[in-house]
């Protein structure tokens, strides 16, 4: 009878992680009587995966009815295979003995694992940054296998060229991650923006896994001031408006302030919101003028989103005749002695 | 049903012969290492020889060169040629059936009475 | 050759008893041992291989261990019908040996 060979048919093996892997196996003779084993790698460290005599191996099974001496097919299936299992397998024929001996080896099965990727996670900077600044967002995905991905960045659909990727670890792994970092220009219509990361991988089938970051949570867009004098409401009264424009986030405090004394803080809450995202807000302040007999200088100074304070002043002039009212003019001052002013904002 | 049915046990003088025969059913017998164990009267077991699937053959030191094991694929039966028996040959004989990868013994036959007398 | 030895040579046990038999041999056998269990006028019956593994249909309540040249048979809670004789064997190599068996008869 010719000598016993092991046949390991596949030199490789592909197998999707969570699936069971096939490892195909026969030998070409019944002797030497002796057990069929399979391990992982070769060489002294190498790891049994399966012993024919002994052993509880709760992921392998035999392929084939293993109670019958004329079954020379050794083949297993390993179920639930993660990356961690990818590796070279090989069958492996022993001679009975005190100890077993090795008698004759396969020539081994590689096993790839292919692995997703996990979704990707976009992360932008810690603190928000205004309009024509460059901020950094980066992407992370893990656990993939094979190496092979392609990650692309998008602004509102917009393909980003100014990014680097890492792919880690560079040398051989049972799996891998990628890390991305882009660079992008904040503009003031960037609120509804999104900043999108997009990884394919040949376990999406072709159906790429995104990642997205709202610049919403990045970008702060400073107010633009505007104070203003409208027309007499009743005798001897003035309303004076703050107009608060094109802010983002909402978070603002807003004070007045009467010749550099503070007159009135207060919160913005009814906003009005533009098409762009950002908010517009009002507060106004009504001055009776006859009870000031010297010019008023009204400063409406603006707190945005923890910022130092920006502010814009209207001087309110006490004037002999009163006249219609607009910016930046006087009112007339009747001569009263009480100081009433009175606000609110909308 | 897998199965070992011995024959062909019985008396004999001393010197004389005999030929046991088992014949296996419910698998196939050239695929297995096969294996006579014997069983004197009130003593213990004692394996006495036996036949690889490649056809070769071992031999306790006692019966060497007197017994001779043999099988015949065809009939799917296993033979023991006895000759020069001795009364220390008396014994039930029993077929046995080696495992499936280690050839530790899994099926037995009912045995068959051996008796070298005078 | 490999010589077996089982010890006890007979053993009176009551029903419900756990039991161990013990089988030694003179030389390393990795773990190439079987246990049989024989009553009188039956052909033996195969328990274990390989030291430990039970072959089909044995109940659980049979256990085997060991390794190189120290063995045992425990049997955990005897039943009237496990009353009869047990035997070791090795078969490593040719030729393969019994132990001299273990008797286990009700108190």
């Known amino acids: 009878e010719e000598e016993l060979q092991v046949i390991q048919p596949d030199k490789s093996v592909s197998v999707a992680a969570g699936e069971s892997a096939i490892l195909h196996c026969t030998v070409t003779s019944l002797i030497p009587v002796g057990p069929i084993q399979w391990f992982r790698g070769a060489g002294p460290a190498r790891e049994l995966i399966y012993n024919q005599k002994e052993g509880h191996f709760p992921r392998v099974t035999t392929v084939s009815e293993s109670t019958k001496r004329e079954n020379m097919d050794f083949s297993i299936s390993i179920s639930n295979i993660t990356p961690a299992d990818a590796g070279t397998y090989y069958c492996v024929k022993f001679r009975k003995g005190s100890p077993d001996t090795e008698f004759k080896s396969g020539a081994g099965t590689e096993l790839s694992v292919r692995a997703k990727p996990s979704a990707p996670v976009v992360s932008g900077p810690a603190a928000r940054a205004t309009p024509q600044h460059t901020v950094s967002f980066t992407c992370e995905s893990h656990g993939f296998s094979p190496r092979d991905i392609t990650l692309k960045w998008f602004k509102n659909g917009n393909e980003l060229s100014d990014f680097q990727t890492n792919v880690d670890p560079v040398g051989e792994s049972v799996s891998y991650s990628i890390h991305s970092t882009a660079k992008v220009v904040l503009t003031r219509e960037d609120v509804h923006s999104q900043v999108i990361c997009e990884v394919a991988h040949v376990t999406l089938q072709g159906d790429p896994l995104r990642g997205t970051a709202n610049l919403s949570e990045t970008i702060r867009v400073p107010p633009t001031l505007e104070v203003t004098q409208q027309p007499v409401r009743a005798e001897n009264q003035v309303n004076v408006t703050c107009q608060v424009r094109k802010f983002y986030p909402q978070r603002l405090q807003l004070t007045w302030l009467e010749n550099g004394n503070v007159s009135r803080t207060e919160t913005a809450s009814t906003v009005t919101e533009n098409k762009d995202g950002t908010y517009n807000w009002m507060s106004w302040l009504l001055v009776n003028v006859s009870a000031h007999r010297d010019d008023v200088k009204l400063t409406c100074q603006v707190e945005h989103d923890g910022q130092p304070a920006v502010s814009k002043s209207h001087d309110l002039k006490v004037s002999a005749h009163p006249k219609e009212q607009g910016s930046n003019t006087a009112a007339e001052n009747t001569g009263s002695n009480e100081r009433n002013i009175y606000g609110g904002s909308g | 049903e897998v199965q070992l049915v011995e024959s062909g046990g019985g008396l004999v003088q001393p010197g004389g012969s005999l030929r046991l025969s088992c014949a296996a059913s419910?698998?196939?017998?050239?695929?297995?290492?096969m294996h006579w164990v014997r069983q004197a009267p009130g003593k213990g077991l004692e394996w006495v020889s036996a036949?690889?699937?490649?056809?070769?053959?071992y031999y306790t030191g006692s019966v060497k060169g007197r017994f001779t094991i043999s099988r015949e694929n065809a009939k799917n039966s296993l033979y023991l040629q006895m000759n020069s028996l001795r009364a220390a040959d008396t014994a039930v004989y029993y077929c046995?059936?080696?495992?499936?990868?280690?050839?530790?013994?899994?099926?037995w036959g009912q045995g068959t009475m051996v008796t070298v007398s005078s | 050759d490999i010589q077996m030895t089982q010890s006890p040579s007979s053993l009176s046990a009551s029903v419900g008893d756990r039991v161990t038999i013990t089988c030694r041999a003179s030389q390393d056998i990795n773990n190439y041992l079987a246990w049989f269990q024989q009553k009188p006028g039956k052909a033996p019956k195969s328990l274990i291989y390989?030291?430990?593994s039970l072959h089909s249909g044995v109940p659980s309540k049979f256990s085997g261990s060991g390794s190189g040249t120290d063995f045992t048979l425990t049997i955990s809670s005897l039943q009237p019908e496990d009353f009869a004789t047990y035997y070791c064997q090795q078969y490593v190599s040719y030729p393969y040996t019994f132990g001299q068996g273990t008797k286990l008869e009700i108190k």
């Open positions: 419910g698998f196939t017998l050239s695929s297995y290492d």
């Open positions: 046995v059936r080696g495992g499936v990868w280690d050839d530790a013994f899994d099926i």
């Open positions: 390989t030291a430990s």
């Open positions: 036949i690889g699937t490649a056809g070769d053959t």
